[in-house]
């Protein structure tokens, strides 16, 4: 429904606190390099303006769109050209082109310093001195590093962040209370960011139809008792929410997400029996809870799919009359029967079904042509099942760190042109699939593993898109969203790759490695492993293992030495020479 003043409408719907937080997130996600204080100033100005519009919706400029208001405000930043270069050219454009321009300049890998966690006492003092600024700074730092973070969910994280400090800064052992909570928030936050990044990539690179198909499959698995019409309504609403958030329309997104949560809770009887607890929670917790709710039980005695989708004489008639509705029904019916399948597998099956109908519903004997379509699904189902079985066996045999190393080698050989930090980050995350999913029973392994891998490979795709270096990566990332993982799995060693020149500096280590956390030390070793493979892509597993074992022993030895730096210098030279000899460099 039309409002005289959109900004007043959203301010009233969301309340001042959420309004300010969401505007801060929006600005930080657009201007990722701007100092905190500048953003706070802009947010305060927008908030004061919004209040004047609440008081009088007919006041000057109150009828302007949010994009116009926010864009005008961002374009007042004095250092735009010096800090952002060509992004400043966006300000010469009119809406909606200006907003599209800002969106295109969002940087998935901004050149920002790593967030270093201060001492607990320092954090608690800052929290008590100015709670509001402390929490705003959290929103700002996360938003600028994760420009596609799901804004209403970030409000939920901020609420938990605040709760952690409120509780733990009063505790006897502040660190023991706070640090595990902060670690959990950090890990969950990274996962949430990556999941949302895939949703935005799906919408932006493959379109609304692709996102809706994903949503039909996922919601049908989650709410198998809901009617198709109900699932379709939820999909339409959810698509609107994510389209808005991915498009930078964070106020509308948060408002619509709240409306969707309200609708789901008001209609839970026709949606799912698992929503009761979620719906008793306050808004932010409620929305989060609904998004994570477990799959409802499948209705008993669901009929065979073949009757409606293969045996019926009306298959082609139904398909031709409303292609997307019919395919949506197929996807809904298949997904609600298969919580044991990954969403991407369900989408592959639906695509196969669609391709078959496109062919067979133009054939002279359509029924004979599509009669065996379900037989075509068998290899598509078996491929991820076998892959997960093999990789879980490998994970159980090696443990997480060595499993990551195996993936590092595998992926470096596939796409050696990709930067070493990206290969390390992506392979480490791919390797986490083991501890995340292999513990699950068979029925939960595939949805856990393959849908998680889709999220991780999307990280590779968005990072690679910024600076493309590999045609193979571009091909796997752009050809088909649902076939990204099989595409990467199918890549063999890149025979066209010219090995990197050997550089001793890459393999020179210092005593500072000894003071690093276990995770940081692993990253150093894994960085060396990637570089090793880039120098010697034809090295065997055994050769690489021998070198890495020697390397681990070298680090352990020198970290125990009295004169660590001398040890690293002298033993390092020997190690490099021995490794060169072992690998024939």
């Amino acid at each position: 429904d039309a409002h005289k003043s959109e900004v007043a409408h959203r301010f009233k719907d969301l309340g001042e606190e959420n309004f300010k937080a969401l505007v801060l997130i929006a600005f930080a996600q657009y201007l990722q390099q701007c100092p905190f204080e500048d953003h706070v100033k802009l947010v305060n100005e927008v908030t004061e303006f919004a209040k004047t519009c609440v008081a009088d919706e007919s006041a000057e400029n109150c009828d302007k769109s949010l994009h116009t208001l926010f864009g005008d405000k961002l374009c007042t930043v004095a250092t735009l050209r010096e800090t952002y270069g060509e992004m400043a050219d966006c300000c010469a454009k009119q809406e909606p082109e200006r907003n599209e321009c800002f969106l295109q300049h969002k940087d998935d890998n901004p050149n920002l310093p790593r967030l270093v966690r201060p001492e607990v006492d320092v954090m608690c003092t800052a929290f008590h001195d100015n709670e509001e600024t402390f929490l705003k700074k959290y929103l700002y730092e996360i938003a600028r590093r994760h420009p596609y973070f799901y804004a209403p969910e970030l409000l939920f994280f901020a609420k938990r962040y605040k709760a952690a400090f409120t509780e733990c800064c009063q505790a006897a052992d502040k660190a023991a209370c706070l640090l595990p909570k902060l670690d959990e928030l950090r890990d969950e936050g990274k996962a949430s960011s990556a999941k949302q990044r895939l949703k935005c990539a799906s919408l932006q690179k493959f379109g609304e139809r692709a996102f809706k198909a994903w949503a039909v499959a996922r919601l049908s698995q989650r709410f198998p008792k809901a009617e198709f019409a109900e699932v379709s309504k939820l999909v339409t609403d959810l698509t609107k929410v994510h389209t808005e958030c991915c498009h930078g329309d964070l106020l509308e997104c948060a408002d619509d997400r709240a409306d969707l949560a309200k609708y789901i809770c008001e209609n839970q009887d026709s949606i799912s029996s698992k929503l009761k607890e979620c719906c008793e929670k306050p808004l932010l917790e409620k929305s989060h809870c609904i998004a994570e709710v477990e799959n409802d039980e499948m209705p008993a005695d669901l009929p065979s799919l073949a009757a409606d989708f293969v045996e019926s004489k009306d298959v082609c008639k139904n398909y031709a009359e409303a292609k997307d509705v019919f395919l949506g029904m197929f996807l809904y019916e298949y997904a609600r029967r298969h919580p044991d399948y990954s969403v991407v597998l369900l989408l592959r099956l639906a695509k196969t079904y669609e391709t078959t109908l496109e062919k067979c519903c133009a054939a002279a004997d359509p029924h004979e042509c599509y009669a065996k379509v379900f037989d075509e699904f068998k290899p598509l189902v078996e491929e991820p099942q076998n892959l997960i079985k093999q990789n879980c066996e490998l994970f159980e045999q090696l443990g997480e760190y060595k499993f990551q190393n195996a993936l590092l080698v595998r992926y470096t050989k596939k796409v050696p042109q990709v930067s070493t930090p990206t290969l390390v980050e992506v392979s480490r995350n791919l390797g986490k699939v083991g501890s995340k999913c292999c513990k699950h029973p068979e029925a939960k392994r595939m949805p856990c593993a393959e849908d998680y891998l889709s999220v991780v490979l999307n990280q590779l795709c968005v990072l690679h898109e910024k600076t493309p270096v590999s045609d193979r990566v571009t091909k796997c990332c752009t050809e088909s969203l649902v076939n990204r993982r099989p595409c990467f799995s199918a890549l063999e060693v890149d025979e066209t790759y010219v090995p990197k020149e050997f550089n001793a500096e890459t393999f020179t280590f210092h005593a500072d490695i000894c003071t690093l956390s276990e995770k940081e030390r692993q990253i150093k070793k894994q960085t060396a492993l990637v570089e090793l493979v880039k120098h010697k892509p034809k090295a065997t597993k055994e050769q690489l293992k021998a070198v890495m074992d020697d390397f681990a022993a070298f680090v352990e030895k020198c970290c125990k030495a009295d004169d660590k730096e001398t040890c690293f210098a002298e033993e390092g030279k020997k190690l490099v020479a021995a490794s060169q000899a072992a690998l024939g460099l």
Partner: antibody, heavy 118, light 106 residues
Framework: QVQLQQSGAELVRPGSSVKISCKAS????????MNWVKQRPGQGLEWIGQ????????YYNGRFKGKATLTADKSPTTAYMQLSSLTSEDSAVYVC???????????WGQGTTLTVSS | QIVLTQSPAIMSASPGEKVTMTCSAS?????MHWYQQKSGTSPKRWIY???KLASGVPVRFSGSGSGTSYSLTIRSMEAEDAATYYC?????????FGAGTKLELK
């Protein structure tokens, strides 16, 4: 734009074979059935069969089994129809036509005239 | 195979006159398509999926029917409509055409 360009007229001896071609352009050749239709002078249309270039699947009218062989080549996006053991009954215009959803033929070639005569 | 019988075989109509031709199937068919052919040229898709007009076909044409009985109607005959019209069924292998209705201008 979609175009179907057929090979030129043929004059052949009885008992011999002929291969007519239909070069497709302007669309995804692999994803549509290519149909072949026979029309004798002053007479109606008779469906011979169809081929799906994506995988080579074919359907034939039983009356033309053993007479017509349909093939397709994806790289020059061309469909072919070979007619064998020709008799004067095979003298006709042969037309290729693209088949679409629910079996209509939306684009037609210009036709190839085959004359079988001694 | 399904036999399609078109009637009349030949008909003539004056400009402005309403024209109806029929296509009767020997057993039920899923969809009927109609093609227009003028001498010396290949057929053109004219009406498809029983009732949809092909691109560029004047709105005076319409198609209808179900089961075994289908028809093509011209609301108001024009000179350019003089041609032979063929029906074609889809839904049963082999695909078959009717023998055609030749429409002449009176």
């Amino acid at each position: 734009q979609v175009q179907l360009q057929q090979s030129g007229a043929e004059l052949v001896r009885p008992g011999s074979s002929v291969k007519i071609s239909c070069k497709a352009s302007g669309y995804a050749f692999s994803n549509y059935w290519m149909n072949w239709v026979k029309q004798r002078p002053g007479q109606g249309l008779e469906w011979i069969g169809q081929i799906y270039p994506g995988d080579g699947d074919t359907y034939y009218n039983g009356r033309f089994k053993g007479k017509a062989t349909l093939t397709a080549d994806k790289s020059p996006t061309t469909a072919y129809m070979q007619l064998s053991s020709l008799t004067s009954e095979d003298s006709a215009v042969y037309v290729c036509a693209r088949g679409v959803l629910l079996g209509s033929f939306d684009y037609w070639g210009q036709g190839t005239t085959l004359t079988v005569s001694s | 195979q399904i036999v399609l019988t078109q009637s009349p075989a030949i008909m003539s109509a004056s400009p402005g006159e309403k024209v109806t031709m029929t296509c009767s199937a020997s057993s039920s068919v899923s969809y009927m398509h109609w093609y227009q052919q003028k001498s010396g040229t290949s057929p053109k898709r004219w009406i498809y999926d029983t009732s949809k007009l092909a691109s560029g076909v004047p709105v005076r044409f319409s198609g209808s029917g179900s089961g075994t009985s289908y028809s093509l109607t011209i609301r108001s005959m024009e000179a350019e409509d003089a041609a032979t019209y063929y029906c074609q069924q889809w839904g049963s292998n082999p695909l078959t055409f009717g023998a055609g209705t030749k429409l002449e201008l009176k």
